[in-house]
């Protein structure tokens, strides 16, 4: 991959250990926790990132617990099981043999059960709604300029194909970014919207996973765009299966 040999690091993932032990002495990086080789020219899967986050010693963690608003971790942090491609396994269990089914972004989509719980397939999250509230500014941002800036961000920083950014809505101070990506639309090599959303979430919280420049510099016509609250909603291709008791 693209980590240079003179200083063996992974530009797209801080949570790695790298060494020049690849073919021809090329730099090879492995995710903390799983030890899986990662491609440093693109985003690392969310599953491997969460696993790395859980494996890091508490005093060495570069990432903090998400705020109460981050629906992605409603059940708290957990050490996920990832498949050989780095995706979430459909069934996740904790150390006390409590199990549940997750979607492709690792969010629980069923009631919790025991080891007998079956999760037949990994259900794809095909629609992600990122709801942001920006800090007060002198005036509202121009909608088309804001739209262009956020689309540019997802294209450049996360390498997400522009067609997957379905819409950017704005009613001051609320910004909504809609990401859509059906199974049939996602080609080999395409960044997954779930991974892009997770990197964005970490960036917005000032916990960038990238090396180098690190933090975001979001600006609309030179005016800083500072986010003070983030909510992320996930919609799956197949609706979740929760009992009525939970819904009440």
């Amino acid at each position: 991959h693209t980590a240079a040999q003179d200083n063996c690091t992974c530009p797209t993932n801080k949570m790695t250990v790298c060494s020049p032990d690849g073919p021809g002495g090329r730099c090879q990086c492995r995710a903390l926790g799983s030890g899986m080789a990662v491609d440093c020219s693109t985003l690392t899967s969310k599953c491997l990132l969460l696993k790395a986050r859980m494996s890091a010693p508490k005093n060495a963690r570069t990432l903090v617990r998400p705020s109460e608003h981050a629906l992605v971790d409603n059940d708290g942090l957990y050490d996920p099981d990832c498949d050989p491609e780095g995706r979430f396994k459909a069934r996740q269990c904790n150390q006390t043999s409590v199990c549940w089914c997750v979607n492709s972004v690792g969010v629980r989509r069923t009631d919790k059960g025991d080891l007998s719980l079956r999760c037949d397939e990994l259900v794809r999250t095909h629609h992600i709604l990122i709801d942001l509230r920006h800090r007060p500014t002198a005036g509202a941002f121009n909608h088309s300029d804001l739209d262009a800036e956020l689309r540019r961000l997802f294209r450049e920083r996360y390498r997400l194909h522009p067609k997957f950014v379905a819409a950017v809505h704005y009613e001051q101070p609320t910004i909504q970014i809609e990401l859509r990506q059906n199974t049939s639309q996602k080609a080999a090599g395409d960044v997954d919207i779930g991974d892009a959303a997770y990197y964005f979430e970490r960036d917005i919280k000032g916990e960038s996973l990238f090396q180098g420049r690190g933090g975001l510099d979001l600006r609309v016509r030179g005016e800083p765009l500072q986010v003070e609250r983030t909510l992320i909603y996930y919609l799956d291709e197949i609706p979740p299966k929760f009992s009525m008791k939970r819904l009440t």
Partner: antibody, heavy 126, light 105 residues
């Protein structure tokens, strides 16, 4: 059309300082990173440094680190390279260049340059 | 790496396809054409495979892993120049190759 016009070159004395200015037009200057690249006589291109669009971030090549300062004035659409403690090896043509990928995690890469100035020649000699 | 690795020279007959490779970088690659020493470089390819609108379609770029390739399909006499590749190392310092001289026979 994008135009980048460098000025400030000429004969400089060793140990002294120089200030090169690049005036940009033809694009929204406030939205793009800017680079300085130099080329010694008969040699290849050498990356000097980069400044992000807001001016809050700069990065420099080891050969000029500690001696170079890149700054920008978004109101005037100008970017400046200040280089102190000049050496003979600083001799060459200095190019201002426009970046295209300000959010990229590899935004400092020379691979993100999409436009160049005509260059200004600097000679460091006593 | 202090510089990216690219061949010092390549040659081809008019109409042939030329490939120039570049390796050792981290991040995006670009390709820059310089027709004579001291003349301003011209960006042929940026961000691995993006071509500027005024660059002929016979120029294309690709990147796989840490290697990039500039391809000129149906090379012309006017394509004679020195071609520099550009990228960065993993410490985010920009890098260029030493240049490849393209001779059209």
């Amino acid at each position: 059309a994008v135009t980048l016009d460098e000025s400030g070159g000429g004969l400089q004395t060793p140990g002294g300082g120089l200030s090169l200015v690049c005036k940009a037009s033809g694009f929204d200057f406030i939205d793009y990173d800017m680079f300085w690249v130099r080329q010694a006589p008969g040699k290849g291109l050498a990356w000097v440094g980069v400044i992000n669009r807001s001016g809050s971030y700069t990065n420099y090549a080891p050969a000029v680190k500690g001696r170079a300062t890149i700054s920008r004035d978004n109101g005037q659409s100008t970017v400046r390279l200040q280089l102190n403690n000049l050496r003979a090896e600083d001799t060459g043509t200095y190019y201002c260049a426009k970046g295209v990928c300000t959010h990229c995690w590899d935004a400092d890469s020379a691979g993100n340059i999409d436009a160049w100035g005509h260059g200004t020649e600097v000679i460091v000699s006593s | 790496a202090l510089a990216l690795t690219q061949p010092s020279s390549v040659s081809a007959n008019p109409g042939e396809t030329v490939e120039i490779t570049c390796s050792g970088g981290s991040g995006n690659y670009g390709w820059f054409q310089q027709k004579s020493p001291g003349s301003a470089p011209v960006t042929v390819i940026y961000n691995n495979n993006y071509r500027l609108s005024d660059i002929p379609s016979r120029f294309s770029g690709s990147a796989s892993g840490s290697t990039a390739t500039l391809t000129i399909t149906g090379v012309r006499v006017e394509d004679e120049a020195v071609y520099f590749c550009g990228s960065a190392d993993s410490t985010y310092v920009g890098l260029f190759g030493a240049g490849t001289t393209l001779t059209v026979l």
